[in-house]
Amino acid sequence: DPVLCFTQYEESSGKCKGLLGGGVSVEDCCLNTAFAYQKRSGGLCQPCRSPRWSLWSTWAPCSVTCSEGSQLRYRRCVGWNGQCSGKVAPGTLEWQLQACEDQQCCPEMGGWSGWGPWEPCSVTCSKGTRTRRRACNHPAPKCGGHCPGQAQESEACDTQQVCPTHGAWATWGPWTPCSASCHGGPHEPKETRSRKCSAPEPSQKPPGKPCPGLAYEQRRCTGLPPCPVAGGWGPWGPVSPCPVTCGLGQTMEQRTCNHPVPQHGGPFCAGDATRTHICNTAVPCPVDGEWDSWGEWSPCIRRNMKSISCQEIPGQQSRGRTCRGRKFDGHRCAGQQQDIRHCYSIQHCPLKGSWSEWSTWGLCMPPCGPNPTRARQRLCTPLLPKYPPTVSMVEGQGEKNVTFWGRPLPRCEELQGQKLVVEEKRPCLHVPACKDPEEEEL
């Protein structure tokens, strides 16, 4: 199926930028892995690079405004021609759900006191209003609540006195059109405008004051332009060469508004001064290699020794990583493929342990299923031996940091009948549904 092809993918927003054009295949668009595509206008934007997870979205608002609720966030597998970690296809959403609490308590309504006395009328002649008030304290609301209805009410009042009305001008009317629209005519062009004493008219009984000043004014028309000449397009110029050596590019033709040039405020030529076409080199663009994440550390060993576990003998271990995705003469990955460090092996060593404090509450699982729960733990944490934190392995090479490696066997006193982990679980409340914000299709 044809797609819309773009020259840029904006990682921060997940949007396609720089429309190249439509009607091309995904394979042609993605000859350049810096490009991106959309299956339809306004649809999901997918970059042409190999798939990886987007950044996590911000947490959605809490599902309730008071007491405990839940909130979701998501990230999307974006890219082309492959899968993200977890072996999922591009377009897939991964969700996280956590408990939240915007406000501990929920608002409670209050009640009104009785109405106070009426205040005096707001005017001394004709009709006005008077007001009375009441207090929201019977009882007072709690936790940011309020009382239903209004704290004051008003009613009409009549002083039985007639007020005089003074005249005031309505706004000026528009200027009448000038007698000519461009300069050089037989009569000097003039324009006039008028206004009425009607906003309001002065009263008769009791008598109001008339409007001050004149009801009309006149002026000479100035700055009339010479009569305008509309612009016209010249012919299209030659097609520019394809500006790229790989993937898709854009060629351009230009024309000039000079047949004739617009004069004296005449309109510029309608339409575009440039038009573009997609050009296809049919050559794939270079793809730089990207490091995979580091592999696991190898066991901590010392040459010519069977085992150094549970002993104050430093060893060495290494880990590696793979440069993936390099194609079509792209750059190799920068940096080292192997990482080496010094270590003490505590693999399967019986060590004295102590119980940790409670961990923070974990995420709610499953985020997209029924009855999600969250958990926290206390762990039997090993007390590490007091071995030297640095060693000098080779003369003249200075001190090297030494890291503990391996899974020891910590021993703690029993806690709630457990020797290694004590876990507490709680249900997550007011759980929202996992719904694709793009909602690709309903």
Epitope: V88, P90, T92, L93, P366, G369, P370, D436, E439
Partner: nanobody, 129 residues
Framework: QVRLVESGGGLVQAGDSLRLSCATS????????MGWFRQAPGKEREFVAA????????YYADSVKGRFTISRDNAKNTVYLQTNSLKPEDTAAYYC??????????????????????WGQGTQVTVSS
Amino acid sequence: QVRLVESGGGLVQAGDSLRLSCATSGRTLSSYAMGWFRQAPGKEREFVAATTWRDTSTYYADSVKGRFTISRDNAKNTVYLQTNSLKPEDTAAYYCAAEEPSKYSGRSYYMMGASYDYWGQGTQVTVSS
């Protein structure tokens, strides 16, 4: 363990309708995302329709959109595929699939057979012209 059993297939004329059912023994279907797939002889398995566990989103393949409808009856522990205006190219074995609640969602995810944990044995639909 969830066991899925499809029924409702058969031989029909082009333009006719069928209602396929997928019932379960064992656990309740209400907490699962459910999908229908089909496979014609000599062809790869193809996504047809899916619905999320709360039925907040429903997805269809372009080839069946507007003709097929996926729905469920939690009280009967059954998921349905209503197929209208059938065409000869709809001829295939139709399979029902269930996905344990997970942290993933989206059209791309539910279109992949690998996303589902349990499968039925299938029911044959044949459409003659």
